[in-house]
């Protein structure tokens, strides 16, 4: 009876996500058969989050909208380890929007999920950010410095990275 009600709960939770994510990839968390963590297929997973590389070329606003209709946000990078994971799936000749912007052009950077912007956990390329008209952040590869962040005009179409919390069922 307990297992039956657990299954029913799982199915209703899966139905919630079905509109945008018809297929989920789930893994068992720890040793308890009842705890599964899932990411939409073909998203990748790292720690408690799922990531999707969007290859459509869109402005920052539309990239964020694209993530939001999938139940996600443009990526918020919290640690070097998280960035190191993300870059494994990126192409060196492309740039990708992050969920980081400076709407007023006053160098008050803010993350889309309201995570406080911490100067000590940023990975700007040297000399960046460097232009008050460039109010959105991308991650890209520079041969001299490898992967890092750069400010860019928000209307320039780029690829993007979406991030959402893992789905626990």
């Amino acid at each position: 009876n307990f297992m039956y009600s657990k299954t029913v709960k799982r199915l209703s939770k899966l139905r919630e996500y079905q509109q945008y994510h018809p297929s989920l990839t789930c893994v068992m968390e720890g040793k308890d058969i009842e705890d599964w963590s899932c990411c939409p297929t073909p998203w990748t997973s790292f720690q408690s989050s799922c990531y999707f590389i969007s290859t459509g070329m869109q402005s920052w606003t539309k990239s964020q909208k694209n993530c939001s209709v999938m139940g996600a946000d443009l990526v918020v990078i919290n640690t070097r380890e998280e960035q190191d994971f993300i870059i494994q799936n990126l192409k060196r000749n492309s740039s990708y929007f992050l969920g980081l912007s400076d709407p007023g052009g006053r160098r008050h950077w803010q993350w889309v999920d309201q995570t406080p912007y911490n100067e000590n956990v940023t990975f700007w390329h040297s000399g960046e950010p460097n232009n008050l008209d460039e109010r959105c952040a991308i991650i890209n590869f520079r041969s001299s410095e490898e992967w890092g962040w750069n400010d860019i005009h928000c209307h320039v179409p780029q690829k993007s990275i979406c991030k959402m919390k893992k789905i626990y069922i």
């Epitope: 459509g56 070329m57 869109q58 402005s59 606003t61 539309k62 909208k65 694209n66 209709v69 232009n131 008209d133 460039e134 860019i152 005009h153 209307h155 320039v156 179409p157």
Partner: antibody
């Protein structure tokens, strides 16, 4: 007032290149993207690509990739669109357009007719 | 790439008529749609953006509606200066494709 003034009509032979200019005035040139759109005689409109004059970043329609190059000269507030390996199907009026704050084309140049003929 | 299908390709109408032009996208463009008016030998002129927002200086007889993949431009009472070709264009992702155009002619 915002103005985009384009260079004059051109006649080119197949295989040649053409470079069309678009001089901006009446606003901060480096703050707004410039897009290029073309229109073949009696036909519809086709988006070619865009350039950000501040940093020089570009994004091209895949259809033209490898043939189109967009550049800018901030000292003269001018954007250039060069199309190479011209063929007769490239005969068209080429327009530059500014993308406004709302992310739509709010101002357009007057157009430049490029004729490709042997 | 998102394709834009505009209909009709042409129509004949009289001054005072109500005119409706439709535009269908091959995918959801989330209201990122513009409508333009073009007269012979001239550059297109922005009429509406975000599917329904009137551009500055555009008469209120022009209106737009729609969502998802289907959008409409309506001219409530056609004026002599409205005889022109109308285009829709999406701005969801590149390439920012246009519809094929609708030529509004005098009946």
């Amino acid at each position: 007032q915002v103005q985009l003034v384009q260079s004059g009509a051109e006649v080119k032979k197949p295989g040649a290149s053409v470079k069309v200019s678009c001089k901006a005035s009446g606003y901060t040139f480096t703050s707004y993207l410039i897009h290029w759109v073309r229109q073949a005689p009696g036909q519809g409109l086709e988006w070619m690509g865009t350039i950000y004059p501040g940093g020089g970043d570009t994004s091209y329609n895949q259809k033209f990739k490898g043939r189109v190059t967009m550049t800018r000269d901030t000292s003269t507030s001018t954007v250039y669109m060069e199309l190479s390996s011209l063929r007769s199907e490239d005969t068209a009026v080429y327009y530059c357009a500014r993308m406004g704050d709302n992310e739509y084309f709010d101002y357009w140049g007057q157009g430049t007719l490029v004729t490709v003929s042997s | 790439d998102i394709q834009m299908t505009q209909s009709p390709s042409s129509l004949s109408a009289s001054v005072g008529d109500r005119v409706t032009i439709t535009c269908r996208a091959s995918g959801n463009i989330h209201n990122y749609l513009a409508w333009y008016q073009q007269k012979p030998g001239k550059a297109p002129k922005l009429l509406l953006y975000d599917a329904e927002t009137l551009a500055i200086g555009v008469p209120s007889r022009f209106s737009g509606s729609g969502s998802g993949t289907d959008y409409t431009l309506t001219i409530s009472s056609l004026q002599p200066e409205d005889f022109a070709t109308y285009y829709c264009q999406h701005f969801w992702s590149t390439p920012y494709t246009f519809g094929g155009g609708t030529k509004v002619e005098i009946k």
